[in-house]
Interface confidence: low
């Protein structure tokens, strides 16, 4: 299934023509130097493919549209009745150039197709390729792809989120979350049980690729050395290897902690202590107060020694319906001594007080190392029960179909030349007759990506 | 006093499931694994399970795993052992003890009767 | 599993006699840190198991000083001096080194 057995758009035959430059004659020196003018032609692969589609027939032929329903949410939101249409981008610079796009906002979506033949983890690569345009930006939502696993049980019309699928990949995002999935499901060669296993984060700032509404290649590769890549047009974001850099790692480690093993009573985890030698002062005075009287203060002349800060208002009057058997003696609320306003202040002088030079406080005697020090304590360690060793988890489960299973609260999120490979070669022709030209009409080419593409031509004329 | 106290045992039939609980005091409970172990009528000593002092791993003797489930609540000084899918080998006496390795405090038991 | 063979099952002995009970293991007891995890316990009638004997000879406090435990590697021994009416009931070895924990069969001791 390449998809390009019918309705190929066969606009011209050489890349010679498809980039138009007129080269022998010389630009017209007032006018603005023009950009090449591309035309497209569907994409063909130049070798052996698992799976590949371009859409330019303009039908959803050989995918299939889920007719599932999540099992765990309301009826009214469980189907996957989120619409998909096959159809240029809404401001396509290269006419003819169709994708799959995702129509519905606030929807579960979930269409697949089946695999030419299944691919199975052995001596070859894994590719995988396929461009994600967010025509509308995105807001919450993935455009991932799940790579289904081959299973007896396998019904594409039944595809939903729990069906099983070997890898999942591409980029999500939600709020301010940038991801790009890498996952793969890893079975316990122990108890068969399968657990996801995550990809790193990439260090690269994957920001614009969500906002830039231009169109993104992104590319897996799995080598059966273990090693991954990840790419996004054309450069790698992250790296590693399935060994080391995935999360929870496949392998659990040899040993754990002693389950049983528990801090002894007489554990001194205590780095330092008060030295036992040391001993108080003499003059070391533990009673004396931190604050005292300030002796060479005086009194503010005009202190009204006898008048009170506070009187009763002389205003008040006790409330009609104040009942003295429940609410008590009735007292004027106070106010402030309006004679203490003319003057410096009212009532009992008291010196202020300040910070004693003599206050030492507690004595401690100073810390010295812990002579007794024995670090800090960890169990101690046993042999893991769990343990098991896969030392070639490239070796998946196969997978024979493609799905995308997809929320997203925007819409026209537009999907392009999908390629499943094992050939590093074929998957970048594929690319730079799809996603090179959309890139050269974009006028984003960086300087020498026509000529990139000329040369190619010219490999394979 | 360190002292532990089992509770929960009875007659139940194959099948079915019970939760049995020991309480502890007189220790830091939150310090110390803590272990199950049963004695059939008339038999020796079998270890049932052992849940580390947090909570975070536990394991079970082969004879009850993906059946019983050990588990602890350190604020309230109590383990926990449920047990479901009952057979009749399992009828015995079940007791805690404090972990540690040595099994130091063990308590009173509690019988539980699988029988149809 | 490391299987803990217990000899003999039943020992009758006359009060104020020596008595001797032998644990033997399947495998060595003797951790990495070089610590031997092998307990007694000792099961009175109607009653809970209670500690002895911790790491081979280590004795519990309460214990009365007859009750002795020495042993290395895979041979272990829980001797009584002079056996006393107290002393009745199943004693029983138990290993602490290796998963699963399990113990020896038992050994009945009872007055002749």
């Known amino acids: 299934h390449d998809g390009h057995d019918d309705d190929v758009i066969d606009i011209e035959d050489d890349l010679d023509d498809v980039i138009e430059e007129v080269e022998d004659s010389k630009p017209d020196t007032t006018a603005p130097p023009s950009s090449p003018k591309v035309t497209y032609k569907a994409p063909v692969p130049t070798g052996e493919v698992y799976f590949a589609d371009s859409f330019d027939r303009g039908t959803l032929s050989g995918w299939i549209l889920s007719k599932a329903k999540k099992d765990d949410t309301d009826d009214e939101i469980a189907k996957y009745d989120g619409k998909w249409e096959v159809e240029e981008m809404k401001e396509s610079k290269l006419p003819g150039d169709k994708g799959l796009v995702l129509m519905s906002r606030a929807k579960h979506h979930a269409i697949s197709a089946k695999l030419n033949k299944p691919f199975l983890f052995d001596t070859k690569p894994l590719i995988v390729q396929y461009e994600v345009n967010f025509q509308n930006g995105i807001e919450c939502g993935g455009a991932y792809v799940k790579l289904l696993s081959k299973t007896p049980e396998l019904n594409l019309d039944q595809f939903h989120d729990k069906t099983p699928y070997t890898i999942m990949f591409g980029p999500d995002k939600c709020g301010e979350d940038y991801k790009l999935h890498f996952i793969f499901r890893h079975k316990n060669p122990k108890t068969g049980i399968y657990e996801e296993k995550h990809a790193k984060r990439p260090d690269a700032d994957l920001k614009t690729y969500f906002t830039d509404k231009k169109t993104h290649l992104y590319t897996l590769i799995l080598n059966p050395d273990n090693s991954f890549e990840i790419l996004v047009d054309q450069s790698v974001v992250n790296s590693g290897n399935l060994l080391n850099d995935m999360t929870p790692p496949v392998n659990p480690s040899r040993e754990i902690e002693d389950p049983e093993d528990r801090k002894p009573e007489d554990w001194d985890e205590r780095p330092k202590i008060p030295d036992p030698e040391a001993v108080k002062p003499d003059d070391w005075d533990e009673d004396a107060p931190a604050k005292i009287p300030d002796e060479e203060a005086t009194k503010p002349e005009g202190w009204l020694d006898d008048e009170p800060e506070y009187v009763p208002d002389p205003d008040a009057e006790k409330p009609e319906d104040w009942d003295e058997d429940m609410d008590g003696e009735w007292e004027a609320p106070q106010i402030a001594n309006p004679r203490c306003e003319s003057a410096p202040g009212c009532g009992v002088w008291q010196r202020p007080v300040i910070d004693n030079p003599n206050y030492k406080g507690k004595w401690k005697p100073p810390m010295i190392d812990n002579p007794s020090y024995q670090g800090i304590w960890k169990p101690r360690k046993i042999p893991n029960p769990d343990f098991f060793e896969d030392l070639e988890p490239f070796r998946m489960t196969p997978f024979s179909a493609i799905g995308l299973e997809l929320w997203s609260m925007t819409s026209d999120i537009f999907f392009d030349n999908f390629i499943i490979c094992a050939d590093r070669r074929i998957v970048d022709d594929w690319a730079n007759d799809g996603w090179g030209l959309k890139k050269a009409a974009d006028g984003a080419a960086e300087p020498g990506v026509v000529g990139q593409m000329i040369e190619a031509a010219e490999e394979r004329p | 006093e360190v002292q532990l106290v089992e509770s929960g045992g009875g007659v139940v039939q194959p099948g079915r499931s019970l939760r049995l609980s020991c309480a502890a005091s007189?220790?830091?409970?939150?310090?110390?694994?803590m272990h199950w172990v049963r004695q059939a009528p008339g038999k020796g000593l079998e270890w049932v399970a052992v849940?580390?002092?947090?909570?975070?791993?536990?394991y079970y003797a082969d004879s009850v795993k993906g059946r019983f489930t050990i588990s602890r609540d350190n604020s309230k000084n109590t383990l926990y052992l449920q047990m479901n899918s009952l057979r009749a080998e399992d009828t015995a006496v079940y007791y805690c003890?404090?972990?540690?390795?040595?099994?130091?405090?063990w308590g009173q038991g509690t019988m539980v009767t699988v029988s149809s | 599993d490391v299987v803990m063979t217990q000899s003999p099952l039943s020992l009758p002995v006359t009060l104020g006699q020596p008595a001797s009970i032998s644990c033997k293991s399947s495998?060595?007891?003797?951790?990495?840190?070089?610590?031997?995890?092998l307990n007694w316990f000792q099961q009175r009638p109607g009653q809970s198991p209670r500690r002895l004997i911790y790491?081979?000879?280590n004795r519990d406090s309460g214990v009365p000083d007859r009750f002795s435990g020495s042993g290395s590697g895979t041979d272990f021994t829980l001797e009584i001096s002079r056996v006393e009416a107290e002393d009745v009931g199943v004693y029983y070895c138990?290993?602490?080194?290796?998963?699963?924990?399990?113990f020896g069969q038992g050994t009945k001791v009872e007055i002749k």
């Open positions: 007189g220790f830091t409970f939150s310090s110390y694994g």
């Open positions: 138990m290993q602490g080194t290796h998963w699963p924990r399990t």
């Open positions: 849940i580390s002092y947090d909570g975070s791993n536990k």
């Open positions: 003890a404090r972990g540690g390795r040595a099994f130091d405090i």
């Open positions: 790491k081979v000879s």
């Open positions: 495998q060595s007891l003797v951790n990495s840190g070089g610590d031997t995890f």
